[in-house]
Interface confidence: low
């Protein structure tokens, strides 16, 4: 019969013959022949392969380096890589999470729109009219100006995006 030009799913072509791929978590030891099947071996400790494959070496699990602010979010198996995340107060610098940086703080005049996670930084927004932030913070939102009227007071000093209004008593001397 004619040698195949394509193989079935979970097979690969070698020496004009289709051989079974190794299952996830195992590496290739030797290709099949017509009298012996593909030989595969399980990946070792701290190694993985996450696909049906013909790799002769397993990949090393990612190392979550604490010196870079990293910690293990999910321990790797023979079929999955280790997932790293950042320590509290830090976030990943990339999707691969190879290192961490401190969460950004929102300066005075800006409030936190979205609090940072292990994989995304703080998102800040300028405080709109009627709101202010007088601190540099990674958690504080813009606060609304104090309503002097509800306290039966009057505005003595207008608020800004960085300062609250200053309220004072009403001037009762005028008739």
């Amino acid at each position: 019969p004619e040698p195949p030009t394509a193989c079935r799913e979970k097979q690969y072509l070698i020496n004009s013959q289709c051989c079974s791929l190794c299952q996830p978590g195992q590496k290739l030891v030797s290709d099949c022949t017509e009298f012996t099947e593909t030989e595969c071996l399980p990946c070792g400790e701290s190694e993985f392969l996450d696909t049906w494959n013909r790799e002769t070496h397993c990949h090393q699990h990612k190392y979550c380096d604490p010196n870079l602010g990293l910690r293990v979010q999910q321990k790797g198996t023979s079929e999955t890589d280790t997932i790293c995340t950042c320590e509290e107060g830090w976030h990943c610098t990339s999707e691969a999470c190879e290192s961490c940086v401190l969460h950004r703080s929102c300066s005075p005049g800006f409030g936190v729109k979205q609090i940072a996670t292990g994989v995304s930084d703080t998102i800040c927004e300028p405080c709109p009219v009627g709101f202010f932030s007088n601190v540099s913070s990674a958690f504080e939102k813009c606060h609304p100006w104090t309503s002097c009227e509800t306290k039966d007071l009057v505005v003595q000093q207008a608020g800004t995006n960085k300062t609250d209004v200053v309220c004072g008593p009403q001037d009762r001397l005028r008739a």
Epitope: P1, C18, L21
Partner: antibody, heavy 126, light 112 residues
Framework: QVQLVESGGGVVQPGRSLRLSCAAS????????MHWVRQAPGKGLEWVAV????????YHADSVKGRFTISRDNSKNALYLQMNSLRVEDTAVYYC???????????????????WGQGTTVTVSS | DIVLTQSPLSLPVTPGEPASISCRSS???????????LDWYLQKPGQSPQLLIY???NRASGVPDRFSGSGSGTDFTLKISRLEAEDVGVYYC?????????FGQGTKVEIK
């Protein structure tokens, strides 16, 4: 019909050589991997060697490695086992065996060792 | 190398009665394509071995349906539903997953 016939056995002294032959008929010999399996008197079956259909791949049991060589001649539909430096423990009936398979889309689906010869007796004795 | 251990080594059976032989492997014979690479062979007195079962549970051509193979991974069983006089002989399991091929020690089935 499908048949394997071994020949070449006999009585031989330790250290001497012998060449076993296996004549295949009734099937396309060049499409099959072939094995030699032996059986010492009153003992179980022991695998000896295997050769791929084109003769490109060969494996031998550790017990015979370096002394025995499996080979084939597809033009003659013949399998061979060259046995050198024979030992008393090589005394056995030697069987020529076909590795059955079913070829589907290039993949050899194993069907067992489906055809066995009648065996040829090798006696190594001083 | 893979080691196969058969039990029992001797099995006297009354004709018409069932018989069961076990074969245990030192490592899994379940391959990634879903097949168990274990065969069963019968060697009748004075004859060459013959194939009974391949890939764990597939009966070879011409083998009566009173023979059946089962099991997966490391534990396998050959069953004869009703023993007949012509079934006597030595039964061997063999792993076909790796080279070198290895056989069990054999189980001698005889008439009780």
């Amino acid at each position: 019909q499908v048949q394997l016939v071994e020949s070449g056995g006999g009585v031989v002294q330790p250290g001497r050589s012998l060449r076993l032959s296996c004549a295949a008929s009734g099937f396309t010999f060049s499409s099959y991997g072939m094995h030699w399996v032996r059986q010492a008197p009153g003992k179980g079956l022991e695998w000896v060697a295997v050769i791929s259909k084109d003769g490109g791949n060969k494996y031998h049991a550790d017990s015979v490695k370096g002394r025995f060589t499996i080979s084939r001649d597809n033009s003659k539909n013949a399998l061979y086992l060259q046995m050198n430096s024979l030992r008393v423990e090589d005394t056995a009936v030697y069987y020529c065996v076909r590795r059955g398979h079913q070829l589907v889309l290039g993949y050899y689906y194993y069907n067992g060792l489906d055809v066995w010869g009648q065996g040829t007796t090798v006696t190594v004795s001083s | 190398d893979i080691v196969l251990t058969q039990s029992p080594l001797s099995l006297p059976v009354t004709p018409g009665e069932p018989a069961s032989i076990s074969c245990r492997s030192s490592q899994s014979l379940l391959y990634s394509n879903g097949y168990n690479f274990l065969d069963w062979y019968l060697q009748k007195p004075g004859q060459s071995p013959q194939l009974l079962i391949y890939l764990g549970s597939n009966r070879a051509s011409g083998v009566p349906d009173r023979f059946s193979g089962s099991g997966s991974g490391t534990d396998f069983t050959l069953k004869i539903s009703r023993l007949e006089a012509e079934d006597v002989g030595v039964y061997y399991c063999m792993q076909a997953l790796q080279t070198p091929r290895t056989f069990g020690q054999g189980t001698k089935v005889e008439i009780k």
